[in-house]
């Protein structure tokens, strides 16, 4: 903290300009009026202030706005945003998407910091839901943003927002998150025709149930192996050899390379060896001929 001293004669700042970079910390504290700083925040971004000087400017704003900065100041924080703590940001009420964009721009190219995460959380909570424009903005800056949300948070994403999601935005999502997103995507893309629908829904299929995979197998979609490997194991297991063959189309040959990995490995264990042999891929590990398969889960359900 900079100790309070009187501003030297002739050094009182009349505007926020480059001359201030030559002030010592105590001179900035003494000679820059916080209200002037607040009205000319947009200028700070263009001036090569040091870390220490930015600390002083932040301190002045903190004193002026102990309950949190108004949005008119927040929008122009620029590099000063990087000095804010999550505690500071929790005091803010950010409602404008332009403000959000301005602050995300400052952090561009860096990992999502606790400050940014707090800012996004405040913004989304203020809006009540993750609308399409917000999602567009967030995934543009942070492609992995969607997968950083909990399934509970994802449940507030309206289906209309799913149109903004790109395949790379889902790269780090786990099955629990895809379970929530898939039904929304299915709803969002329901009016599209077969091939277009598959292109859009493909990234979300890690959350698809068996019946939807069966339906897709009837549509000549030619799912690639990378997508197949991301499907839920429990959704793949009930599929027949014929259904998997139709689902993968020419990509079915890729099963051989993946036979030791889930879900292919577990699926092979559930198929009759006779059926697997029809693929001509040399897949081994199926149920030998003459063995009876008891579906214990079905038996439990009946009792």
């Amino acid at each position: 903290e900079v100790e309070k001293t009187a501003c030297p004669s002739g050094k009182k700042a009349r505007e926020i300009d480059e001359s201030l970079i030559f002030y010592k910390k105590w001179e900035l504290e003494a000679c820059v009026d916080a209200a002037l700083l607040a009205t000319q925040m947009d200028r700070v971004n263009a001036i090569p202030f040091t870390y220490e000087q930015l600390d002083v400017l932040k301190h002045k704003l903190d004193e002026l706005y102990p309950q949190g900065y108004p949005e008119s100041v927040i929008q122009h924080l620029g590099y000063l945003f990087l000095k804010m703590s999550p505690e500071d940001i929790r005091k803010w009420n950010v409602t404008s998407l332009e403000t959000l964009k301005a602050l995300l721009e400052v952090n561009k190219g860096h990992e999502m910091s606790p400050q940014v995460a707090t800012l996004i959380d405040r913004f989304v909570k203020g809006r009540g839901q993750l609308d399409k424009d917000t999602l567009d903005t967030l995934t543009a800056f942070y492609p992995g943003y969607l997968c950083s949300l909990s399934p509970e948070e994802l449940s507030s994403v309206p289906p209309s927002s799913i149109w903004a999601v790109r395949p790379q935005d889902l790269d780090t999502c786990d099955p629990r998150q895809l379970d929530v997103l898939y039904p929304k995507a299915r709803l969002a893309f329901q009016n599209m025709n077969g091939s277009e629908y598959f292109v859009k829904i493909q990234s979300f299929l890690g959350g698809a149930p068996t019946e939807d995979l069966k339906a897709l197998s009837q549509q000549n979609v030619s799912m690639d192996l990378a997508t197949f490997m991301k499907l839920r194991t429990d959704a793949v297991l009930p599929l027949t050899v014929a259904e998997v063959q139709k689902l993968l189309g020419p990509h079915v040959e890729g099963l051989k390379a993946e036979e030791r990995h889930r879900p292919v490995r577990d699926w092979i264990l559930r198929q009759r060896q006779d059926d697997l042999d029809t693929l001509g891929l040399g897949l081994q590990g199926g149920i030998p001929n003459g063995y009876l398969v008891l579906d214990l889960s079905m038996q439990e359900a009946l009792s």
Partner: antibody, heavy 119, light 106 residues
Framework: EFQLQQSGPELVKPGASVKISCKAS????????MNWVKQSNGKSLEWIGI????????SYNQKFKGRATLTVDQSSSTAYVQLNSLTSEDSAVYYC????????????WGQGTSVTVSS | QIVLTQSPAIMSASPGEKVTMTCSAS?????MHWYQQKSGTSPKRWIY???KLASGVPARFSGSGSGTSYSLTISSMEAEDAATYYC?????????FGAGTKLELK
């Protein structure tokens, strides 16, 4: 150990441009501003400008504004000054100098780069 | 811009002699900094914030002053002190340097 290593001497023709580099080591490059200073033949020193390596923000001496451009490359911890439309008046030694904490002068200087403008 | 006038431009001193050089500013400045430069080398920060000695600077050096008048003093001249000394203000935009005082060994 702190070090500012500048690029070698330059011989350039009038009207041409020159770009001088200054590679910093031994400290966190983005934590301190970098200054550039001109020293004409055995004469005094002239401040050209300053750059914040973290944000790329700059401030120039009005005399050099428009002809000098300060930039940085964070990945290599290197600062640059580019001088355009050179005349014989620009023949000098150019120094990069780190801005000291809380404006405590320029605490570390590069070894200097000699620029000679001659046809 | 603030003009800094150093005097004398050139001076010589014998070993053990007290040396004082001055720097006068055309307008008041908060602090004055001093740099030492020897022939063919880059300047070194010598005294900063008017009176603080930079790391490695012998205690025989001192700095003082305020407003428009500042000085650098060597209590007892030594051969290694022969160099040019520049004053510099960092209070006003742009920072400026004095023309230097060349100190020679008598």
């Amino acid at each position: 150990e702190f070090q500012l290593q500048q690029s070698g001497p330059e011989l350039v023709k009038p009207g041409a441009s020159v770009k001088i580099s200054c590679k910093a080591s031994g400290y966190s490059f983005t934590d301190y501003n970098m200054n550039w200073v001109k020293q004409s033949n055995g004469k005094s020193l002239e401040w050209i400008g300053i750059i914040n390596p973290n944000y790329g923000t700059t401030s120039y001496n009005q005399k050099f504004k428009g002809r000098a451009t300060l930039t940085v490359d964070q990945s290599s911890s290197t600062a640059y000054v580019q001088l355009n439309s050179l005349t014989s008046e620009d023949s000098a030694v150019y120094y990069c100098a780190r801005g000291g904490y809380d404006n405590e002068a320029m605490d570390y200087w590069g070894q200097g780069t000699s620029v000679t403008v001659s046809s | 811009q603030i003009v800094l006038t150093q005097s004398p431009a050139i001076m010589s001193a014998s070993p053990g002699e007290k040396v004082t050089m001055t720097c006068s500013a055309s307008s008041s400045v908060s602090y004055m900094h001093w740099y030492q430069q020897k022939s063919g080398t880059s300047p070194k920060r010598w005294i900063y914030d008017t009176s603080k000695l930079a790391s490695g600077v012998p205690a025989r050096f001192s700095g003082s002053g305020s407003g428009t008048s500042y000085s650098l003093t060597i209590s007892s001249m030594e051969a290694e002190d022969a160099a040019t000394y520049y004053c510099q203000q960092w209070s006003s935009n742009p920072p400026t340097f004095g023309a230097g005082t060349k100190l020679e060994l008598k």
